[in-house]
């Protein structure tokens, strides 16, 4: 993974990091799929949204997610290069007013309706991984990533840099 040398070494800074601007630097509407090309889908059930990981039928339309990218500053003593220790953080919104949230107590990923400013649980540090894949690390729980478990999204603890390229925390973004 890019920028990793033992997850805990630098992710201590996540709790203290600050989003440097209230506006995203860019936004991107994309479909989200796993390393193994299963699609992440969102379904409204009993007035709440459920998140699924599934194989789509041929020609079935993929759900889109709005990714909003923010810059976040490492505290200078953590990054080792003063104000230049920038990270890229992202929020993920599959539908208006709903955002993916990390529920660290339940080790789950949920869709919550909320207003801006978004809570820290809605922010994930973006990691560029294994070739052209990305991973999402919880801002509120360093070393914990969005991953796939039993055909659902879950929070998965990653305890060493070697494990950062495990397929279940790798995702692909696509405009199609």
């Amino acid at each position: 993974a890019f920028g990793i040398s033992g997850v805990q070494k630098y992710t201590r800074a996540l709790h203290d990091s600050s989003i440097t601007g209230i506006s995203p630097i860019t936004e991107y509407l994309a479909s989200l799929s796993t390393y193994n090309d299963q699609s992440i889908t969102f379904a409204l059930e009993d007035e709440s949204y459920e998140i699924y990981v599934e194989d789509l039928k041929k020609d079935e339309k993929k759900d889109k997610v709005l990714l909003s990218y923010y810059e976040s500053q490492h505290p200078s003593n953590e990054s080792g290069d003063g104000v230049d220790g920038k990270m890229l953080m992202v929020t993920l919104s599959p539908t208006k007013d709903f955002w993916l949230h990390a529920n660290n107590k339940e080790h789950s990923v949920e869709l919550h309706k909320c207003e801006k400013p978004l809570p820290d649980q809605a922010f994930f540090v973006l990691h560029n991984m294994h070739s052209n894949c990305v991973s999402f690390e919880c801002k509120t729980d360093p070393g914990v990533f969005i991953g796939v478990k039993d055909n659902h999204l879950a929070l998965i603890k990653v305890d060493s840099s070697e494990n950062l390229c495990t397929e279940n925390i790798l995702f692909k973004l696509s405009e199609t």
């Epitope: 993974a1 890019f2 920028g3 990793i4 040398s5 070494k9 630098y10 630097i25 860019t26 990218y69 490492h74 990054s79 080792g80 290069d81 230049d84 220790g85 920038k86 990270m87 890229l88 540090v125 973006l126 990691h127 560029n128 991984m129 294994h130 070739s131 052209n132 690390e137 840099s161 070697e162 950062l164 390229c165 405009e175």
Partner: antibody, heavy 122, light 107 residues
């Protein structure tokens, strides 16, 4: 202050080898992806290779794949590029460059070294 | 591989002119485009990243826009220190690729 200092360039015959080094200071090297970018005399920039912060992932331009090898030694704050089977068209200034973001390559190269010249000629 | 095509390859302009450089990607790269400024005999400098974010140290007369496949670098009022070669680079996917450059010259 971030500093990147390349060394190891020089004159080499076609088919020969060189090892370029980049000494990094002023930041935590292991937190950043690093790259080599080259520029032939009077020509444009060409990305050559990149390596992850841990060194576990490496990437190459098609023009150098199988001939060049990128590596790093974070304990020595150093980045390397091994150049084998050199050709005349590899003649260029080789720059090492550091990414803008600690966990992502999306931001491009924020810091560059001064470059080292590699000349491939018989 | 994603091809990056810059136009024009060179532009002659006067002090105070508005200069526009375009960069086109052969496939969508979201907003993951960087622009670099390089002066003769000097090292390239990151000017704009994520298509429109201005790197600290550069004045606000520089701006970037675009997403997907079409991108623009604009210098709103050209100054003497802006005469240089400008390159676009996609940082979306490997292999990373760079445009051929646009040289901004004094008219």
């Amino acid at each position: 202050e971030v500093q990147l200092v390349e060394s190891g360039g020089g004159l080499v015959q076609p088919g020969g080898s060189l090892r370029l080094s980049c000494a990094a200071s002023g930041f935590t090297l292991s937190s950043y992806a690093m790259s080599w970018v080259r520029q032939a005399p009077g020509k444009g920039l060409e990305w050559v290779s990149a390596i992850s912060g841990s060194g576990g992932s490496t990437y190459y331009a098609d023009s150098v794949k199988g001939r060049f090898t990128i590596s790093r030694d974070n304990s020595k704050n150093s980045l390397y590029l091994q150049l084998n089977s050199l050709r005349a068209e590899d003649t260029a200034v080789y720059y090492c460059a550091k990414t803008l973001y600690t966990t992502s390559w999306y931001g491009g190269f924020q810091h560059w070294g001064q470059g080292t010249l590699v000349t491939v000629s018989s | 591989d994603i091809q990056m095509t810059q136009s024009p390859s060179s532009v002659s302009a006067s002090i105070g002119d508005r200069v526009t450089i375009t960069c086109r990607a052969s496939q969508g790269i979201s907003s993951w485009l960087a622009w670099y400024q390089q002066k003769p005999g000097k090292v390239p400098k990151l000017l704009i990243y994520a298509a429109s974010s201005l790197q600290s140290g550069f004045p606000s007369r520089f701006s970037g826009s675009g997403s997907g496949t079409d991108f623009t670098l604009t210098i709103s009022s050209l100054q003497p220190e802006d005469f240089a070669t400008y390159y676009c680079q996609q940082t979306h996917s490997f292999p990373w690729t760079v445009g051929q450059g646009t040289k901004v010259e004094i008219k």
